[in-house]
Interface confidence: low
């Protein structure tokens, strides 16, 4: 459509729009008190309310306070985001006996398996330890990190929690951030596998591993305990969590007992070169520069790939798909990715500032 590349004078006389030279087109001007959900809003619903810090925009478009995890038996599972509350869960060594919206009203210590019983399923933040009778001939010691048995009493005392560094938390699901409410609800039902081992991990004989007994007295939790700022990788090694100390990075998820800290580019920047659990190179956003061209494609799955324009062509931030159709996807490897999903007449405004995660997806965080 030739009309799809308006010149600067296209917007003149229309006070509800302004011309953005960076993207070379007319953009909708968000009314006072509303903030754009994307670089160049296209319609009124690309604007949204901005909530105060520690508040999120609920499904009725109300700013609602995020729950707090300040109780000492709770840890933050997912942070307060622009469209979802903070989620708290019981800290390691405890499980939730009375649930509450986005949190837990009562946490209890995991039970310890009595004499003659071993751990069938270790306790989690949601469930107590499940015990089963020990097989004949099995020593009453810890046979493996998963199978512990206490040699003492026949009752089930409350377990002592495994000591946990204040720097760690028991994050068992990826934070649900950005996207639409429906996508968020779907994502919140998904749990993630532990992060892949880092290539810069320490071997378990290094000081990353605390010299605690494999099965602390009175505990039904047999996992290793790593030093602060280390996590237990899939191979059972204590591995250093990545650091977000670079100026252009912020922490996305904390260093947890079984997963690395993850870093993302700070608000106003986007990841140009990704790295395991972090970003190797952040560049300023917006990114429609003279040497890049946007290729519209399957916005939902592959997002928008920015790549060098073909030789001899004039760079253009917004090529129109020929015949109204998006071209086939190109490999997004080390490309700049901007998620365009949440912009179709959506009743899900997003808050400024726009942080962009290490996957390149906008993380629109009010928390």
């Amino acid at each position: 459509f030739p009309q799809d590349r308006p010149f600067e004078d296209t917007c003149h006389g229309n006070p509800s729009h302004y011309y953005d030279k960076a993207v070379r087109r007319c953009c909708y001007r968000c009314p006072m008190g509303l903030f754009p959900t994307q670089q160049c809003p296209q319609r009124p619903t690309d604007c949204r309310k901005q909530c105060e810090p520690d508040y999120y925009l609920d499904e009725a478009d109300r700013c609602t306070a995020c729950v707090t995890c300040s109780r000492d038996d709770l840890v933050e599972k997912t942070p307060c985001a622009w469209n979802s509350s903070r989620v708290c869960e019981c800290r390691p060594g405890m499980f939730c006996s009375t649930s509450a919206v986005n949190s837990c009203a009562r946490c209890f210590f995991h039970s310890v398996c009595p004499a003659g019983m071993i751990v069938k399923f270790p306790g989690t933040a949601q469930k107590n330890t499940v015990c089963e009778p020990a097989s004949p001939g099995v020593s009453p010691a810890c046979a493996s990190p998963e199978n512990c048995k206490e040699p003492s009493s026949g009752t089930i005392p409350q377990a002592k929690p495994t000591p946990v560094s204040p720097a760690t938390s028991s994050a068992s699901t990826m934070p649900v951030r950005g996207g639409t409410r429906l996508a968020q609800e779907a994502a919140s039902k998904l749990t993630r596998a532990p992060d892949s081992p880092s290539s810069v991990g320490r071997p378990s004989s290094d000081p990353g591993l605390s010299p605690t007994q494999p099965c602390p007295e009175g505990s039904g939790d047999c996992r290793k305990q790593c030093e602060p700022d280390y996590y237990l990788d899939e191979a059972g090694r204590c591995t250093a969590c990545v650091s977000c100390s670079r100026d252009d990075l912020v922490e996305k998820t904390p260093c947890a007992w079984n997963s690395s800290r993850t870093c993302e580019c700070r608000p106003g920047m986007i990841c140009a070169t990704s790295a395991t659990n972090s970003c190797a190179r952040c560049v300023p956003y917006p990114i429609c520069a003279a040497e890049t061209v946007t290729k519209p494609q399957d916005m939902a799955e592959k997002d928008t790939t920015f790549e060098a324009p073909p030789l001899g062509t004039q760079p253009d931030c917004n090529p129109t798909p020929e015949n109204g159709e998006a071209p086939a996807s190109t490999s997004p490897t080390q490309s700049l990715l901007v998620d365009s999903q949440a912009s179709k007449t959506l009743p899900i405004p997003t808050s400024a500032p726009v942080a962009l995660s290490s996957t390149g997806k906008p993380v629109l965080d009010a928390g």
Epitope: R25, Q42, P296, A300, E325, S340, Q341, P347
Partner: antibody, heavy 124, light 107 residues
Framework: EVQLVESGGGLVQPGGSLRLSCAAS????????MHWVRQAPGKGLEWVSA????????YYADSVKGRFTISRDNSKNTLYLQMNSLRAEDTAVYYC?????????????????WGQGTLVTVSS | DIQMTQSPSSLSASVGDRVTITCQAS??????LNWYQQKPGKAPKLLIY???NLETGVPSRFSGSGSGTDFTFTISSLQPEDIATYYC?????????FGQGTKVEIK
């Protein structure tokens, strides 16, 4: 040739269910928002539901919310509308339509491709 | 919800006449308005998108204008094949809504 073909319509009793399908061909299905629009006999057009590229976002008219579910299978280039708790007022020709909306590309609006429609009759 | 009010509901004009249909939105929708033509027993066809842009392959006698809440659709010279019902549709917010339609007949 860009084409949408609806199927699955028919006669159903009040309270019953139907599943409509819309087979897309001739374009990159996963790159487009898709919609269902209906038209009761002798009446105007009524938007029913929409779904985003990946299916991550869905939208419904108040009249069908909680009863109808829109979904898509991009691997099969097919759009669906699961209709439960059908009422007499749901009787209509149901059209699937392609929405060429693409964010960051101005003036890409409008249902530019429509199917031929499938008739759903809810009657006892 | 955004209500779309179309007028007139029907009109009769002679071949060659200039025909004008108006559409009013209950709130500001900027220029997010489309116009469709529907012939009996057929699916609707997009004619005008984003208030004033002519869809590819649509004759230039069809045009659209307007912004905010008031929009106009014009057939500059009515032809026999233009007998149909015309609908406006707002694309500014969900639920998307259509006008009630204008039936155009030849005198």
């Amino acid at each position: 040739e860009v084409q949408l073909v609806e199927s699955g319509g028919g006669l159903v009793q009040p309270g019953g269910s139907l599943r409509l399908s819309c087979a897309a061909s001739g374009f990159t299905f996963s790159s487009y928002y898709m919609h269902w629009v209906r038209q009761a006999p002798g009446k105007g057009l009524e938007w029913v539901s929409a779904i985003s590229w990946s299916g991550g976002s869905t939208y419904y008219a108040d009249s069908v919310k909680g009863r109808f579910t829109i979904s898509r299978d991009n691997s099969k280039n097919t759009l669906y509308l699961q209709m439960n708790s059908l009422r007499a007022e749901d009787t209509a020709v149901y059209y699937c339509a392609r929405d060429r909306f693409m964010p960051f590309i101005p003036n890409t609006l409008g249902f530019d491709v429509w199917g031929q429609g499938t008739l759903v009759t809810v009657s006892s | 919800d955004i209500q779309m009010t179309q007028s007139p509901s029907s009109l009769s004009a002679s071949v060659g006449d200039r025909v004008t249909i108006t559409c009013q939105a209950s709130q500001d929708i900027s220029n997010y308005l489309n116009w469709y033509q529907q012939k009996p027993g057929k699916a609707p066809k997009l004619l005008i998108y984003v208030a004033s842009n002519l869809e590819t392959g649509v004759p230039s006698r069809f045009s659209g204008s307007g912004s905010g809440t008031d929009f106009t659709f014009t057939i500059s010279s009515l032809q026999p094949e233009d007998i149909a019902t015309y609908y406006c549709q707002q694309d500014a917010d969900v639920p998307l809504t259509f006008g009630q339609g204008t039936k155009v007949e030849i005198k």
